[in-house]
Interface confidence: low
C-alpha cells in the first residue's frame, strides 16, 4: 500500500472553510492521480468530494463539489467549504496512482475537522 | 495519585467560551478541594485559573477570573470564557484534596480547547 | 534518628479504658501524622486510626464509637484512648509515623514509614 | 471499606530463589499501596511505598509492581534474613486496611 500523509487535526474557519494538505509517497512518476475524500462519522464512510489529476492539467472537482485543490507533485491542497457544526467528523484522503501501470492505493489516516458554526450577526436597523 | 479525568477535546464556542467536566476519583469524602486549571502551550505550562472549593459552599474563582464552575460531588464542572484563537492550548485540570489529611493531588491528561475566532459581522449603513 | 516508643498497662480489665502513650523524637509533630495499628496474638495488622499534625483525627469505622486519639506537642507524646475492652481487644498496640512521600512536585503518597516496638496489651478479669 | 487480599498465606523458598507476593485490593486503590516486612516479635518494617518505590535503606533485591487492583512485591534471590512475614497495605482513603500476610518460610 502506498504511504499517504495528512494532518490530524484541522479547525474550519469561521466561514466553514477548512483546507489540508495530503501528500503521498509515489512508488513513480503518475501522470493520471484520482483523488478521493472520504468522511467518517458513526462509524459509517461517505464520499464528499473526488477528481482526477491528469499531468499538466488542474486539479478539477465537479461543478456542484464542494472541494477545491492544487496538485503540486505528490501533494494535493485540498479545501472544503460549507461546512456546518454537523460536519464535524474525520476526513480521509485516499490517493489512487492509475496511470501509468501499475496501479497503486494509499488511504490516510484522516484528518479531523471540527467546525463551530458562528453567531449570527445583529440585525442591522 | 488520585485518578483525574478530563475530555480529550472540546471545541470553544464562536464566542469563545468553552466547557468540559473534570471528574477525580476521590478517596474519601474531602471537605476542602482545590482545583486549578493550567494550559500547556509549546512546552510551557501557565496557570489559568484556581478555585478551592469548601463543603457547602459554592466554587469560587476571583471576580477577573476568566473561569467559572460548579461542583457535584467528585466532578467539576468548569467553563472558561473570553477565548481566543490564540488560546487554544492544552488545558489541563489539577485537582488537590486539601483536607482532612491526606493530601491527595490528580493531575488529568489535559482537554485540548480549539478556539476559532469569529468573522467580523459587517458594519451596518 | 526516627524512633517511637509506646507505653502504658500491660493489663487491663474488661469494660475499662485502655490508656497508651507514644514517646516519638528526630521528627516534628508539627508536619506529619501518626497512626495506631494492633496485632491480635497470631493474627494480622489492623489500622486502628490516626491524628495529623493539626490535629485532625480519623479512625478505623469498626472502633470510631469507643476511640480518641490526641497529642501533646509539648511532651512530644501521642495518646491512644479505647474505651469499653474486652478480650477481643488484647492485642500488641504500635504507633507509627505516617509520612507523605511527594515527588515530582505531582504526586503524595502515603505510608507508615517507622513504627515502634510495640506495646503488649491483654484484657483480663 | 477497601479489601486487601493477599497470597500465598504462606510460603516455603530456599536462599537463592526468586520470590513474588501479590496483593488484590477490592477497589481501584491508584497505586497507593507499603509493602512491610515483620519478624517475629518485631515491630512492621517499610520494604516500599507508592508501590513500586524503595524505602531508603531497604535492599535493591525487593521490588514492587502493579497500578489498580493487583500488585506484587518480588524477592529476587532470597537471603536468610528474609524469611519473615510479608503486609501489604492500601493507603487509599480511610481506613487504611492490610493484607492478612504471607509467612515466608525456609524449605
Known amino acids: 500500500a502506498m504511504h499517504v500523509a495528512q494532518p490530524a487535526v484541522v479547525l474550519a474557519s469561521s466561514r466553514g472553510i477548512a483546507s489540508f494538505v495530503c501528500e503521498y509517497a509515489s512508488p513513480g512518476k503518475a501522470t493520471e492521480v484520482r483523488v478521493t475524500v472520504l468522511r467518517q462519522a458513526d462509524s459509517q464512510v461517505t464520499e464528499v468530494c473526488a477528481a482526477t489529476y491528469m499531468m499538466g492539467n488542474e486539479l478539477t472537482f465537479l461543478d456542484d463539489s464542494i472541494c477545491t485543490g492544487t496538485f503540486n507533485e505528490s501533494r494535493v491542497n485540498l479545501t472544503i467549504q460549507g461546512l456546518r457544526a454537523m460536519d464535524t467528523g474525520l476526513y480521509i484522503c485516499k490517493v489512487e496512482l492509475m496511470y501509468p501501470p501499475p496501479y497503486y492505493l494509499g488511504i490516510g489516516n484522516g484528518t479531523q475537522i471540527y467546525v463551530i458554526d458562528p453567531e449570527p450577526c445583529p440585525d442591522s436597523d | 495519585a488520585m485518578h483525574v479525568a478530563q475530555p480529550a477535546v472540546v471545541l470553544a464556542s464562536s464566542r469563545g467560551i468553552a466547557s468540559f467536566v473534570c471528574e477525580y476519583a476521590s478517596p474519601g469524602k474531602a471537605t476542602e478541594v482545590r482545583v486549578t486549571v493550567l494550559r500547556q502551550a509549546d512546552s510551557q505550562v501557565t496557570e489559568v485559573c484556581a478555585a478551592t472549593y469548601m463543603m457547602g459552599n459554592e466554587l469560587t474563582f476571583l471576580d477577573d477570573s476568566i473561569c467559572t464552575g460548579t461542583f457535584n460531588e467528585s466532578r467539576v464542572n468548569l467553563t472558561i470564557q473570553g477565548l481566543r484563537a490564540m488560546d487554544t492550548g492544552l488545558y489541563i485540570c489539577k485537582v488537590e484534596l486539601m483536607y482532612p489529611p491526606p493530601y491527595y493531588l490528580g493531575i488529568g491528561n489535559g482537554t485540548q480547547i480549539y478556539v476559532i475566532d469569529p468573522e467580523p459581522c459587517p458594519d451596518s449603513d | 534518628q526516627v524512633q517511637l516508643q509506646e507505653s502504658g498497662p500491660g493489663l487491663v480489665k474488661p469494660s475499662e479504658t485502655l490508656s497508651l502513650t507514644c514517646t516519638v523524637s528526630?521528627?516534628?509533630?508539627?508536619?506529619?501524622?501518626l497512626s495506631w495499628i494492633r496485632q491480635p496474638p497470631g493474627k494480622g495488622l489492623e489500622w486502628i486510626g490516626y491524628?495529623?499534625?493539626?490535629?485532625?483525627?480519623n479512625f478505623h469505622p469498626s472502633l470510631k464509637s469507643r476511640v480518641t486519639i490526641s497529642k501533646d506537642t509539648s511532651k512530644n507524646q501521642f495518646s491512644l484512648k479505647l474505651s469499653s475492652v474486652t478480650a477481643a481487644d488484647t492485642a500488641v498496640y504500635y504507633c507509627?509515623?505516617?509520612?507523605?512521600?511527594?515527588?515530582?512536585?505531582?504526586?503524595?503518597?502515603?505510608?507508615?514509614?517507622?513504627w515502634g516496638q510495640g506495646t503488649s496489651v491483654t484484657v483480663s478479669s | 471499606d477497601i479489601q486487601m487480599t493477599q497470597s500465598p498465606s504462606s510460603l516455603s523458598a530456599s536462599v537463592g530463589d526468586r520470590v513474588t507476593i501479590t496483593c488484590r485490593a477490592s477497589?481501584?486503590?491508584?497505586?497507593?499501596l507499603a509493602w512491610y516486612q515483620q519478624k517475629q516479635g518485631k515491630a512492621p518494617k517499610l520494604l516500599l511505598y507508592?508501590?513500586?518505590n524503595l524505602q531508603d535503606g531497604v535492599p535493591s533485591r525487593f521490588s514492587g509492581s502493579g497500578s489498580g487492583t493487583d500488585y506484587t512485591l518480588t524477592i529476587s534471590s532470597l537471603q536468610p534474613e528474609d524469611f519473615a512475614t510479608y503486609f501489604c497495605?492500601?493507603?487509599?482513603?480511610?481506613?487504611?486496611?492490610f493484607g492478612q500476610g504471607t509467612k515466608l518460610e525456609i524449605k
Open positions: 528526630g521528627f516534628s509533630l508539627t508536619s506529619y501524622g
Open positions: 477497589e481501584n486503590i491508584y497505586s497507593n
Open positions: 507509627a509515623k505516617t509520612e507523605g512521600h511527594y515527588y515530582g512536585s505531582n504526586y503524595g503518597y502515603y505510608a507508615l514509614d517507622y
Open positions: 497495605q492500601h493507603l487509599w482513603g480511610t481506613p487504611y486496611t
Open positions: 491524628i495529623w499534625y493539626d490535629g485532625n483525627t
Open positions: 507508592a508501590a513500586t
